[in-house]
């Protein structure tokens, strides 16, 4: 009679390496009397002798996984017990490996110029595997713009035109390589004006072409405005190479003018547009063009450029050197110091610094600025800016100037003229519910009974916009 | 600090006139209009007229046209409301008020006119 | 003229309650109105202006809304000082005109 003999595990399990949908096997040898019961666990839970993946067999002394899968990754021990003394157990790893395989290639993408791209390359493997990409038939080289991200995503900042093109990603390993489909990058480019019309000072009655270059991708198309409308006389011939479009618009010129060159593409939903304008005067008319001290043109600055109307001709200062650059550098100033302001205050100083430094101007024989109604100039600074004025004034008073409208152009409102004395003379200003709660405008009210200086309310003359998200009239 | 200060009550007969003086101090006198307002005993507030201290010009309400005269003097910087033809039911308190809807709310002290035989 | 009309002519309220007086202009006057409160014997006081604006120093329970014909001049949560007589002003053209004005009361 053998006498009994607890269990021995000899072959004690090994690490296994297995390829996803190879079969997979761990051995574990027991000697033991009377033959001992052998379990098998993953991960510490019990292996149902019934689970179809697996096949025990040699008195389970084998556990064989039929077909790996990438979830079998884990921790495997075989138990022996059969009475005699304890249970005795080995443990061994199966590491799943696996080619590479790319879960979520990249798509085509279209990219504004100057923005950042992202093109996705998200892989699995095992040894993780390392991406790379390919544009055309060459590698791609990381540089301060480009880069692989650690998810493998290429992540392009500033993109610029010479980023178009075909680009896949590449995921490999020690197992295999796989690569991506072909995907196309288009970079899109702003409308932007490479020569701009010329101004032309002429004699009554002659011909004038203005050229107007342009470039975007897509190519952009080109529109011509005169003094703020669409032109109503004259010829157009476009020609279009490389990208590039070039306009030409021929006029006979009667009377002096603001002709402005729009250039324009769409990208998706949204437009983007490129400006440029010319004037064409009329020789004999400078003399008094002169005396006005100043011109019209479009206003082609940016800070004021929510709060004027669209296209509106504006007056510029000739008693400054460059007059177009000095008024905004006052209107850029006068905006640094509104930061400084209230929320109820801010609209209505902006409306009133910009309408009173690019005054709405009337383009005649002598171009003519329209001041501020003085009405409005005085809500503004007793009204919507009370606490401010107040400060300011009693800061200048001491001579200490350190209000947040200290710096401000602003304009003496009793030296405006009325509103209630003539609706041409002066130029009304949007007001905005201060609570933002509705868009606020004003109307026409037609005058009844004249009085000297102040006979009823006039019809309003002028438009503006006073942001993206107030319009009033 | 801005102040507009009227001159003292007043009693006067049916048919006479009156004219009344608001006296402005603490700011540019001639940088901002002037209105008249007046109310009667146990009444509302009633517009009157407009006027422009730097010209001179006037705008007053049709019920008022022809029987009041707004003026002003720069060197004292005084407004003056005078009324003509008075009625009994022209007893009110007149007010001068700077502004009233443009700019900032300054209000004369009253002056009560007593119109009776 | 614009004739300009409050309502109601009198009204009475506790204190806390929100009280609401209204003001319609005979034609579109815009925003250009302006709400005044007068106490007996006291020269008239503007709450608002432009329709809504907040006079400095008024408190914050005071609120004007409205543009075109209907305004509205909300009190918020009545106190005891706010008990008096409240008037609306067009200044969208000449005359100028008020309401009739609303004599608010002690419930």
């Known amino acids: 009679e053998k006498l009994p003999k607890a269990p021995v595990i000899t072959t004690p399990l090994e690490t296994v390496d297995a390829l996803v949908e190879e079969v997979a096997t761990f051995m574990c040898a027991v000697e033991s009397y009377p033959q001992p019961e052998i379990s098998w666990t993953r991960n510490k839970i019990l292996i149902k002798l019934f689970d179809t993946r697996y096949s025990i067999r040699e008195n389970g002394q084998l556990l064989t996984i039929l077909s790996v899968e990438d979830s079998d990754d884990g921790i495997y021990c075989c138990i022996a017990n059969n009475g005699v003394g304890g249970a005795v157990e080995s443990c061994g790893a199966l590491q799943v490996k696996m080619k590479p395989k790319i879960t979520r290639p990249p798509i085509n993408v279209k990219i504004i110029e100057g923005l950042k791209a992202v093109l996705p390359c998200t892989t699995m493997g095992n040894p993780k595997p390392s991406v790379s990409w390919i544009k055309g038939d060459n590698a791609l080289r990381e540089n301060s713009r480009i880069a692989v991200l650690e998810s493998g995503s290429l992540r392009i900042h500033n993109v610029q035109k010479e980023d178009a093109g075909q680009y896949r990603c590449v995921a490999k390993n020690s197992l295999g390589t796989a690569y991506s489909k072909l995907v196309k990058l288009e970079v899109e480019v702003f409308a932007r004006i490479l020569r701009a019309p010329e101004s032309h000072n002429v004699t009554f009655g002659s011909f004038v072409t203005l050229r107007c270059t342009a470039i975007g991708i897509p190519v952009p198309t080109i529109s011509w405005i005169e003094n703020g409308n669409a032109v109503s006389s004259g010829s157009i011939q476009e020609s279009v190479k490389d990208r590039v479009i070039d306009s030409r618009l021929q006029l006979f010129i009667t009377k002096p003018g603001l002709y402005t060159c729009i250039a324009t593409n769409k990208h998706g939903e949204k437009f983007s547009t490129a400006k440029a304008a010319a004037t064409v005067s009329i020789a004999e008319w400078s003399k008094s063009q002169k005396d006005s001290q100043g011109y019209c043109a479009q206003y082609r600055g940016e800070v004021c450029d929510a709060v004027l109307a669209k296209d509106a001709l504006v007056f510029f200062n000739t008693s400054y050197r460059d007059p177009e650059d000095a008024q905004e550098l006052l209107i850029h100033t006068a905006w640094n110091e509104l930061k400084a302001v209230s929320p109820l205050c801010r609209p209505a100083a902006e409306a009133l610094l910009c309408n009173h430094l690019f005054q709405e101007c009337s383009p005649g024989v002598v171009p003519t600025p329209m001041p501020i109604c003085r009405e409005y100039c005085l809500a503004v600074k007793e009204l919507f800016c009370a606490k401010e004025w107040q400060a300011m004034e009693g800061k200048a008073h001491r001579g200490l100037y350190r209000s947040g409208m200290h710096l401000l152009p602003v304009p003496e409102c009793s030296k405006l003229p009325s509103m209630h004395r003539d609706p041409t003379a002066c130029t009304r200003l949007p007001y905005l519910d201060y609570k933002k709660e509705n868009i606020t405008t004003f109307p026409s009210i037609t005058s009844s009974r004249p009085s000297a200086d102040i006979p009823n309310l006039p019809a309003s003359t002028s438009s503006f916009a006073v942001s993206p998200a107030y319009s009033m009239t | 600090q801005v102040q507009l200060v009227q001159s003292g009550a007043e009693e006067k007969k049916p048919g006479a006139s009156v004219k009344v003086s608001c006296k402005a101090s603490g700011y540019t006198f001639t940088n901002y209009y002037m209105h008249w307002v007046r109310q009667a005993p146990g009444q509302g507030l009633e517009w009157m007229g407009i006027?422009?201290?730097?010209?001179?010009?006037?705008s007053y309400a049709q019920k008022f046209q022809g029987r009041v005269t707004m003026t002003r003097d720069t060197s004292t910087s005084t407004v003056y409301m005078e009324l003509s033809s008075l009625r009994s039911e022209d007893t009110a308190v007149y007010y001068c008020?700077?502004?009233?809807?443009?700019?900032?709310?300054?209000w004369g002290q009253g002056t009560l006119v007593t119109v009776s035989s | 003229d614009i004739q300009m009309t409050q309502s109601p002519s009198a009204m009475s309220a506790s204190i806390g309650d929100r009280v609401t007086i209204t003001c319609r202009a005979s034609?579109?006057?815009?925003?250009?109105l302006a709400w005044f409160q007068q106490k007996p014997g006291k020269v008239p006081k503007r709450l608002i202006y432009v329709a809504s604006g907040l006079q400095s120093g008024v408190p914050s329970r005071f609120s004007g809304s409205g543009s075109g014909t209907e305004f509205t001049l909300t009190i918020s949560s009545l106190q005891p000082e706010d008990f008096a007589t409240y008037y609306c002003l067009q200044h969208n053209s000449y005359p100028f005109t008020f309401g009739q004005g609303t004599k608010l009361e002690i419930k």
């Open positions: 006027i422009n201290p730097s010209g001179g010009n006037t």
């Open positions: 034609q579109d006057i815009s925003n250009y």
């Open positions: 008020a700077r502004e009233l809807g443009w700019g900032s709310d300054y």
